[in-house]
């Protein structure tokens, strides 16, 4: 973000207690490191974005997934 | 959101230093009480995010303007 | 795959600043934050802050604050962290890694500072 | 800030051994818990992540355990090649912390 432009951050309080279709997910990142709790938001092909807790296999396994392809 | 969805949270880790003009903000919302900093999002006509501290009184008296209007 | 780059070594004065450079390359830059991490034999490993390329975000270990700037160039896929007011205390390797896992590391650079 | 105890500090074994490191928080670090290998003069790699998810790449003798904050790194069979530095690193609250190591050397 440019200098003193102070845009919100997404942060993740909670986290999805479903395991996504995996069809449904296209992209990811990882939340900001200033925020509190550890996150990787899913990104679907709807447009929605989806906090995931990193910690779970099935969101390290979507995450390799999609940097391979 | 939906339940069970779990969307990002906005939340605000700077404020701007500046007043901003009036007449580019469009809207503001407040950040949720999750995060750890008390902060106003205001939405500009370019639609641009930034980040004000709601105890500075421009940014107060901007929330009640947009509230009449 | 996936690398994060860092040059070999850095020899800098008392007093000087440095800025070191970590290139990703093989992933989408902004998906994942970068971390850089302190290796002393006294001190072991510290984690000196992260910033995520996404937005410049940046997050700083207290004993780091002031020592330590982090910034990302999304154009160029790379992380850098500057060091100031540079003393021989600064002298150690200094890596960039990838995630919260940390699972990709760069080859470290090597800081001496020295008159 | 969390707070990582490695013990032992050294650990001498015979190739073939059953090894286990063990990493211990001062307080809960949930299974934010990864182990890395550090050979001498090369950087840090990572072996197991969140406790106990395995790392394409990495022998299947390595192994994790644990949750809270008591961890253990498992080698099933040692061999020569897995001699250096171990260290656990939690990033479960900022700021992220690593253990001193433990020294995994020939007996």
């Known amino acids: 973000a440019p200098m003193g432009s102070d845009p919100p951050t997404s942060c993740c309080f909670s986290y999805t207690s479903r395991q996504l279709h995996r069809s449904f997910v296209m992209d990811y990142y990882e939340t900001s490191s200033l925020c509190s709790k550890p996150a990787v938001v899913f990104l679907t092909k709807r447009g929605r974005q989806i906090c995931a807790n990193p910690s779970e296999p099935w969101v390290t396994e979507y995450m390799s997934d999609l940097e391979l392809n | 959101a939906p339940m069970g969805s779990d969307p990002p949270t906005s939340c605000c880790f700077s404020y701007t230093s500046r007043q901003l003009h009036r007449s580019f903000v469009m809207d503001y919302y407040e950040t949720s009480s999750l995060c750890s900093k008390p902060a106003v999002v205001f939405l500009t006509k370019r639609g641009r995010q930034i980040c004000a501290n709601p105890s500075e009184p421009w940014v107060t008296e901007y929330m009640s303007d947009l509230e009449l209007n | 795959q996936v690398q994060l780059q860092q040059p070999g070594a850095e020899l800098v004065k008392p007093g000087a600043s440095v800025k070191m450079s970590c290139k990703a390359s093989g992933y989408t830059f902004t998906s994942y934050n970068i971390h850089w991490v302190k290796q002393t034999p006294g001190q072991g490993l510290e984690w000196i802050g992260a910033?995520?390329?996404?937005?410049?975000?940046?997050s700083y270990n207290q004993r780091f604050k002031g020592k330590a700037t982090l910034t990302a160039d999304i154009s160029s896929s790379t992380a850098y962290m500057q060091l100031s007011s540079l003393t021989s205390e600064d002298s150690a390797v200094y890596y960039c890694a990838r995630g919260y896992g940390y699972d990709y590391w760069g080859q470290g650079t090597t800081l001496t500072v020295s008159s | 800030d969390v707070v990582l105890t490695q013990s032992p500090a050294t650990l001498s074994v015979t190739p073939g051994d059953r090894v286990s490191l063990s990493c211990r928080a001062s307080?809960?670090?949930?299974?934010?818990l990864h182990w890395y290998q550090q050979k001498s003069h090369e950087s840090p790699r990572l072996l197991i992540k969140y406790v106990s998810q395995s790392i394409s790449g990495i022998p299947s003798r390595f192994s994790g355990s644990g949750s809270g904050t008591d961890f253990t790194l498992s080698i099933n069979s040692v061999e020569t090649e897995d001699l250096g530095m171990y260290f656990c690193q939690q990033s479960n609250s900022w700021p992220h912390t690593f253990g001193a190591g433990t020294k995994l050397e020939l007996k």
């Open positions: 307080q809960s670090v949930s299974k934010y």
């Open positions: 910033v995520s390329p996404r937005n410049g975000d940046t």
